[in-house]
């Protein structure tokens, strides 16, 4: 945790386990207003390592819907539309924070959880292991 | 929000704004124990659209450190090591949830915030706009 001096204007916490349990305002502030709205939009189709997006839904989690990328091919797509296995499509993964209802089904109590999600795919040179 | 019946074993909330403000346990549960430990390890270097990772630190945010990918080239790296500008390296971006201290410097009060991060890069065929 980060040691930060208590500000007298802060909400008080009687929680014995503080700072393990904190108050979180779920009115999400979105910092992305100035970003390019297209973002990764059609990259999944135009990439040399294209991917499909699969919906992962869990009502006990916030956010309840997460999109998982699955690489379409083991190889990478060349300009002529052929898939080249001398190169490999691999998922780019990232650990993200989600809120998990705890106890289950409780609407106002959560635990932070780290999950690994595949965001998209990239084309890499394979490491080839030959057998002697 | 998701309408879920209150479970009698749930912590109570007297917050007038409920369910906008909830209790969150910061003891992170990590679901990634069974995932492939290789993950995106050296992909940033082996990719045809390689990237560098930049540290973004903010003590008012949880997590305080986030790594941002920046594509090394505008084009994509060919097998001979040269950069092909007929293809484009582009960042794969993802919206993630973070906790922002609110009011500032308060150790036990946060607001959920969505931020856009670049996780890695992929090589795409460019969209060519021809002038009439």
């Amino acid at each position: 945790g980060i040691a930060i001096p208590r500000n007298s204007g802060c909400p008080n916490s009687e929680d014995k386990n503080f700072p393990r349990t904190v108050m979180v305002n779920l009115n999400i502030h979105n910092r992305n207003t100035s970003t390019n709205p297209k973002r990764s939009s059609d990259y999944y189709n135009r990439s040399t390592s294209p991917w499909n997006l699969h919906r992962n839904e869990d009502p006990e989690r916030y956010p309840s819907v997460i999109w998982e990328a699955k690489c379409r091919h083991l190889g990478c797509v060349k300009a002529d539309g052929n898939v080249d296995y001398h190169m490999n499509s691999v998922p780019i993964q990232q650990e993200i924070l989600v809120l998990r209802r705890e106890p289950r089904h409780c609407p106002n109590s959560f635990r932070l959880e780290k999950i690994l999600v595949s965001v998209g795919c990239t084309c890499v040179t394979p490491i080839v292991h030959h057998v002697a | 929000g998701i309408a879920i019946p209150r479970n009698s074993g749930c912590p109570n909330s007297e917050d007038k704004n409920f369910p906008r403000t909830v209790m969150v346990n910061l003891n992170i549960h990590n679901r990634n124990t069974s995932t492939n430990p290789k993950r995106s390890s050296d992909y940033y270097n082996r990719s045809t659209s390689p990237w560098n990772l930049h540290r973004n630190e903010d003590p008012e945010r949880y997590p305080s450190v986030i790594w941002e990918a920046k594509c090394r080239h505008l084009g994509c790296v060919k097998a001979d090591g040269n950069v092909d500008y007929h293809m484009n390296s582009v960042p794969i971006q993802q919206e993630i949830l973070v906790l922002r201290r609110e009011p500032r410097h308060c150790p036990n009060s946060f607001r959920l915030e969505k931020i856009l991060v670049s996780v890695g890069c992929t090589c795409v065929t460019p969209i060519v706009h021809h002038v009439a």
């Epitope: 294209p50 091919h73 052929n82 296995y85 394979p126 292991h129 057998v131 | -």
Partner: antibody, heavy 119, light 112 residues
Amino acid sequence: QVELKESGPGLVAPSQSLSITCTVSGFSLTSYGVYWVRQPPGKGLEWLVVIWSDGTTTYNSALKSRLSISKDNSKSQVFLKMNSLQTDDTAMYYCARQGDNYSYAVDYWGQGTAVTVSS
Amino acid sequence: DVVMIQIPLSLPVSLGDQASISCRSSQSLVHSNGNTYLHWYLQKPGQSPKLLIYKVFNRFSGVPDRFSGSGSGTDFTLKISRVEAEDLGVYFCSQSTHAPLTFGAGTKLELK
């Protein structure tokens, strides 16, 4: 249920071309790739080519110059064309579906169509 | 091309026996994504092949649990715990990590 059915000419003269159609049901060609595999009499299996769900392809490089693959998603058909046939191209030709769950195995096979190259 | 070597080429068994078939590849079948694309098929006389095991150890739907796959890298094994009459035929291992996809020469499981 998933089904694949090959239809071909049966007999082809040496140096001529072979055209085989694979008609599928129980799944969409926009969601699954289709492979062609052949098996000479009493021998093992040889993979020829695959057309993926997005229309991209992967060929066996040893045969690429003689092969072409295409599909018609709306008719649920995949087409294989092979040029310059010789007697050693005599085989059972199978079309087969790319496996589910990104397994890249072949999960369902057609019953095969026998092709004999002879004058 | 990746060469797949199956041992033995012929395996005489009695019903109820355990059977084990080995498959070795000329290079590692571990893809850059960490997965290993090694599969097993059974072809009965006059029929097309049927998928038994995909990605080393995953049983395909409807495949009895007497079939199991194991191995890593370049060395793989298919085991049948108690052979039944319907298990007789030719077993092929196959890899799809590298192109071209390649198959082993086959192992014929037959009665002694």
